[in-house]
């Protein structure tokens, strides 16, 4: 089938992928790669987990869900047209020929250009407020879009929220691993 996941330039894209850990904390290695799943592994790896943690990821790619419960859905931050294409989520189940392979097609569309009559709208168009609920990122709620009633005193608060939510993700996923990119 040719099902497509969609996002606009500048948004975050969400590519869902799930598996059932055999027991809580008994994780299976997972890799995400750009390009269709090859026979083994993932090509052009953008993120990888091991039996304990996320052990490799490149800038803009992260897991926002509870990967310790098997939610290994990929978030791609601030997408560009170049992010369009097929992505492979590979659940690397131990044993011969046990891997589950998912090929997800991502289509990036140009951002809708809307008139920006006030400076407040300029800000919110540049910084759409992101949902930070862990593990929830369906397409229709990836961003809350412009917040027309925002006032200038809220701008620094919103900027801090954006920074802090990303930092929280970084801290949660990093463990003792090295940040790449």
């Amino acid at each position: 089938s040719e099902v497509e996941y969609r996002a606009e330039v500048g948004q975050n894209a969400y590519l869902p992928c799930f598996y059932t850990p055999a027991a809580p904390g008994n994780l299976v290695p997972v890799c995400w790669g750009k390009g269709a799943c090859p026979v083994f592994e993932c090509g052009n790896v953008v993120l990888r987990t091991d039996e304990r943690d996320v052990n490799y990821w490149t800038s803009r790619y992260w897991l926002n869900g509870d990967f310790r419960k098997g939610d290994v859905s990929l978030t791609i931050e601030n997408v560009t047209l170049a992010d369009s294409g097929i992505y492979c989520c590979r659940i690397q189940i131990p044993g011969i020929m046990n891997d589950e392979k998912f090929n997800l097609k991502l289509v990036i569309k140009p951002a809708k250009v809307t008139p920006a009559p006030t400076r407040q709208r300029d800000f919110t168009a540049a910084f759409p407020r992101m949902l930070t609920t862990r593990g929830h990122g369906p397409a229709e709620t990836q961003t809350l879009g412009s917040l027309p009633d925002i006032n200038l005193t809220q701008i620094s608060t919103l900027a801090n929220e954006l920074r802090d939510s990303r930092l929280a993700n970084d801290l949660r996923d990093s463990g003792a691993t090295i940040r790449i990119g």
């Epitope: 089938s1 099902v3 996941y5 969400y14 869902p16 992928c17 799930f18 059932t20 869900g65 509870d66 098997g70 939610d71 859905s73 044993g95 011969i96 020929m97 046990n98 589950e100 392979k101 998912f102 090929n103 997800l104 097609k105 593990g135 929830h136 990122g137 369906p138 397409a139 229709e140």
Partner: antibody, heavy 119, light 107 residues
Framework: EVQLQQSGPELVKPGASVKMSCKAS????????MNWVKQSHGKSLEWIGR????????NNNQNFKGKATLTVDKSLNTAYMQLNSLTSEDSAVYYC????????????WGQGTLVTVSA | DIVMTQSHKFMSTSVGDRVSITCKAS??????VVWYQQKPGQSPKILIF???YRYTGVPDRFTGSGSGTEFTFTISSVQAEDLAVYYC?????????FGGGTKLEIR
């Protein structure tokens, strides 16, 4: 075009066993697990389990442990489900189903095999 | 096991009406929910996945939304051919489980 062709209806006696088949075509059989789903008359759907055509490995719903045995014949591109010690509770339509390439939802279904358990 | 609850077993509607069917999961299933349509005498057919994307070839009057534990399936303008049973299913955890189904009846 992906197709799943199931065997015909079965009328069986209580205590007996039945083995139904699901022949796959239109894709590489070993690339996807085959799933089995039960639907009792007028009722909802229950996932029974799945079998890996590459190596015969299975994941079963615990509710069907000892009831359903899932196997494959790679050379025939066919999956099988055997139901043992049948009772009236096992009277149902049984579907084989294959997931989509991009996620674990069932995009392809067989037409179903009706099993009737009656003395 | 995760229990998927569809609160209405039956819903009666008229052609052209908007109708929404809800599904609640007994625990957080993130976005791992899909919706199927089953017409009388037929196999189920996938309509919505992830849980707001229409499957290939599905008319745009069918939409879905939700995340976590609460999900909604909507038909914006019911047609006569929409007479069917609609099921939600979670694929977050094995065993994958289905809702009890909601039968849409056309008045």
């Amino acid at each position: 075009e992906v197709q799943l062709q199931q065997s015909g209806p079965e009328l069986v006696k209580p205590g007996a066993s039945v083995k139904m088949s699901c022949k796959a075509s239109g894709y590489t059989f070993t690339d996807y697990y085959m799933n089995w789903v039960k639907q009792s008359h007028g009722k909802s759907l229950e996932w029974i389990g799945r079998v890996n055509p590459s190596n015969g490995g299975t994941n079963n719903n615990q509710n069907f442990k000892g009831k359903a045995t899932l196997t494959v014949d790679k050379s025939l591109n066919t999956a099988y489900m055997q139901l043992n010690s049948l009772t009236s509770e096992d009277s149902a339509v049984y579907y084989c189903a294959r997931r989509d390439s991009s996620g674990y939802w069932f995009a392809y279904w067989g037409q179903g095999t009706l099993v009737t358990v009656s003395a | 096991d995760i229990v998927m609850t569809q609160s209405h077993k039956f819903m009666s509607t008229s052609v052209g009406d908007r109708v929404s069917i809800t599904c609640k999961a007994s625990q957080d299933v993130s976005t791992a929910v899909v919706w199927y349509q089953q017409k009388p005498g037929q196999s189920p057919k996938i309509l919505i996945f992830s849980p707001s994307y229409r499957y290939t070839g599905v008319p745009d009057r069918f939409t879905g939304s939700g995340s976590g534990t609460e999900f909604t399936f909507t038909i914006s303008s019911v047609q006569a051919e929409d007479l069917a049973v609609y099921y939600c299913q979670q694929h977050y955890n094995i065993p994958w489980t289905f809702g009890g189904g909601t039968k849409l009846e056309i008045r």
